[in-house]
Interface confidence: low
C-alpha cells in the first residue's frame, strides 16, 4: 500500500508519458490522476515502467474501479494484465474478441496461467457460447485448450482450428474427446500426401475407426508402439495379423513387450494361433 502524500509542485502528470519512469512510487501515486491513466492506458505499454511502478498504476485503477475495470480499460492493459489476479479478472465483463486477443498476446509463449484461464472462462460465459471465432482464437494461442472442452463443446470446433494443434497438446485428451476430434483432423488434412498426412493425423488416431486403420496399413506408415497403444480397442480388434504387421512395419517386434496390455492383449486373444506364429514373436493367443 502506497502512503497518501501531496504531489510536489510542478510534478502533476498532464499525460502518461516517458517522464513518469523517473517518478518514485509515492510520486506516481500522488501525481497521476487515475481517470487520466484510464483514458491513456494504451500508452502504458510503450513506457518501460518497473514492476513496482506497475503495481502503483494497478492500485490506482483498482481504486477508480472497485467493481471491476470497464472493457475500454481492459483492452489496453497490455503488460499490466500480468499483474492481475484471478479475483480481479472475475469482476470483469469481457465481450470483445479483440480484447481477448490483446490480453492473450501479452501472455503468449507461456503456459496457460490461472489469470488466463479465468479470463477465458469470463469471456466464454459473457458470450454465452463457444463460437467459431472464439475457438479459432483460443486454439491459436493455446491448442491444448481443446482437451479442456467436453465432447459436446468440441463438436462445434471447426476443422480449420485443428491446423494449430501440436501432438503434445492432445496428451490430456481422453478417448471420447479424440472420437470427436479425429474426423475433424481427417477433414483438415485430407489433401496431404500419405507420409505427411500420417505425421499430422498420428496424434488424433485414438479416435480412428477400424476401416481407417486398415487403410493406413496399406500405406507403409510404420506406426510406433506408443501410438498403437492409444488406439481404440474396438477399432484394433477386427484387424488381421497381416494388417497389424503392415501397420507397425519394423515396430511390430514391440508387440511382445506389450502383450499383457490393452489393446494388444485383447487383440492377441482374437487371433488364430497359426497367424500369430507367422510374426515369430512367441505371442500366445
Amino acid at each position: 500500500e502506497v502512503e497518501k502524500t501531496a504531489c510536489p509542485s510542478g510534478k502533476k502528470a498532464r499525460e502518461i508519458d516517458e517522464s513518469l519512469i523517473f517518478y518514485k512510487k509515492w510520486e506516481l501515486e500522488a501525481c497521476v490522476d487515475a481517470a487520466l491513466l484510464a483514458t491513456q492506458m494504451d500508452r502504458v505499454n510503450a513506457i518501460p515502467f518497473t514492476y513496482e511502478q506497475l503495481d502503483v498504476l494497478k492500485h490506482k485503477l483498482d481504486e477508480l474501479y472497485p467493481q471491476g475495470y470497464p472493457e475500454s480499460v481492459i483492452q489496453h492493459l497490455g503488460y499490466l494484465f500480468l499483474k492481475m489476479s484471478p479475483e480481479d479478472i472475475r469482476k470483469w465483463n469481457v465481450t470483445s474478441l479483440e480484447t481477448l486477443k490483446a490480453l492473450l498476446e501479452v501472455n503468449k509463449g507461456h503456459e496457460m496461467s490461472p489469470q488466463v484461464a479465468t479470463l477465458i472462462d469470463r469471456f466464454v460465459k459473457g458470450r454465452g457460447q463457444l463460437d467459431k471465432d472464439t475457438l479459432d482464437t483460443l486454439t491459436a494461442f493455446y491448442p491444448g485448450y481443446l482437451c479442456s472442452l467436453s465432447p459436446e463443446e468440441l463438436s462445434s470446433v471447426p476443422p480449420s482450428s485443428i491446423w494449430a494443434v501440436r501432438p503434445q497438446d492432445l496428451d490430456t485428451c481422453d478417448p471420447r474427446q479424440l472420437d470427436v476430434l479425429y474426423p475433424k483432423a481427417r477433414l483438415a488434412f485430407q489433401n496431404m500426401n500419405g507420409s505427411e498426412y500420417f505425421v499430422k493425423i498420428q496424434s488424433f488416431l485414438g479416435g480412428a475407426p477400424t476401416e481407417d486403420l486398415k487403410a493406413l496399413s496399406q500405406q507403409n506408415v510404420s506406426m510406433d508402439l506408443a501410438t498403437f497403444m492409444k488406439l481404440r480397442t474396438d477399432a484394433v480388434l477386427p484387424l488381421t495379423v497381416a494388417e497389424v504387421q503392415k501397420l507397425l512395419g519394423p515396430h511390430v517386434e514391440g508387440l511382445k513387450a506389450e502383450e499383457r496390455h490393452r489393446p494388444v492383449r485383447d487383440w492377441i486373444l482374437r487371433q488364430r494361433q497359426d497367424d500369430l506364429d507367422t510374426l515369430g514373436l512367441g505371442l500366445q493367443g
Partner: nanobody, 127 residues
Framework: QVHLVESGGGSVQAGGSLRLSCAAS????????MGWFRQGPGEEREGLAQ???????KYADSVKGRFTISKDNAKNILYLQMNSLKPEDTGLYIC?????????????????????RGQGTQVTVSS
C-alpha cells in the same frame, strides 16, 4: 489442391513501397495459414510473414515494422504491403499455404513439408 498466383512485384528505389498480392483458389483456401517468403539470388529462402485464418500475423525480425501481411478472406487474396524497402529486400517473393502453421518451422524452412506455393513475383530494390 490449392493454386497460388502472385503479382505486384517490380523495381523500386530504396525507401519506396510495393504491395504484393497472392490470389488463392482451390479446396483448402480457407483453412490453416498463409505466408510470404523471399528467395534470394543464391536460392536461400527466408520466411518473412505468416497469417492464420483468424488474422494473427507473425513477422521475421528483418521485416518487422516495415511489412504488413493481410488477407481478404472473402476474395481469398493474400497481401504483403512493403514499406521502407532496402536493397537487401531484393528477391523473388513467393506466397505459400503451409500445411503446418508452425511459425518456427516456417522460419527455419518456408517449404518444410512441401506446401502449395506460387511461382513468385520479382522485387528489385536499387539504392
Amino acid at each position: 489442391q490449392v493454386h497460388l498466383v502472385e503479382s505486384g512485384g517490380g523495381s523500386v528505389q530504396a525507401g519506396g513501397s510495393l504491395r504484393l498480392s497472392c490470389a488463392a483458389s482451390g479446396d483448402r483456401v480457407s483453412t490453416g495459414c498463409m505466408g510470404w517468403f523471399r528467395q534470394g539470388p543464391g536460392e536461400e529462402r527466408e520466411g518473412l510473414a505468416q497469417i492464420h485464418n483468424y488474422n494473427i500475423a507473425k513477422y521475421a525480425d528483418s521485416v518487422k515494422g516495415r511489412f504488413t501481411i493481410s488477407k481478404d478472406n472473402a476474395k481469398n487474396i493474400l497481401y504483403l504491403q512493403m514499406n521502407s524497402l532496402k536493397p537487401e529486400d531484393t528477391g523473388l517473393y513467393i506466397c505459400t499455404a503451409p500445411v503446418d502453421c508452425s511459425w518456427s518451422m516456417f522460419l527455419q524452412d518456408p517449404l518444410a513439408l512441401s506446401p502449395p506455393r506460387g511461382q513468385g513475383t520479382q522485387v528489385t530494390v536499387s539504392s
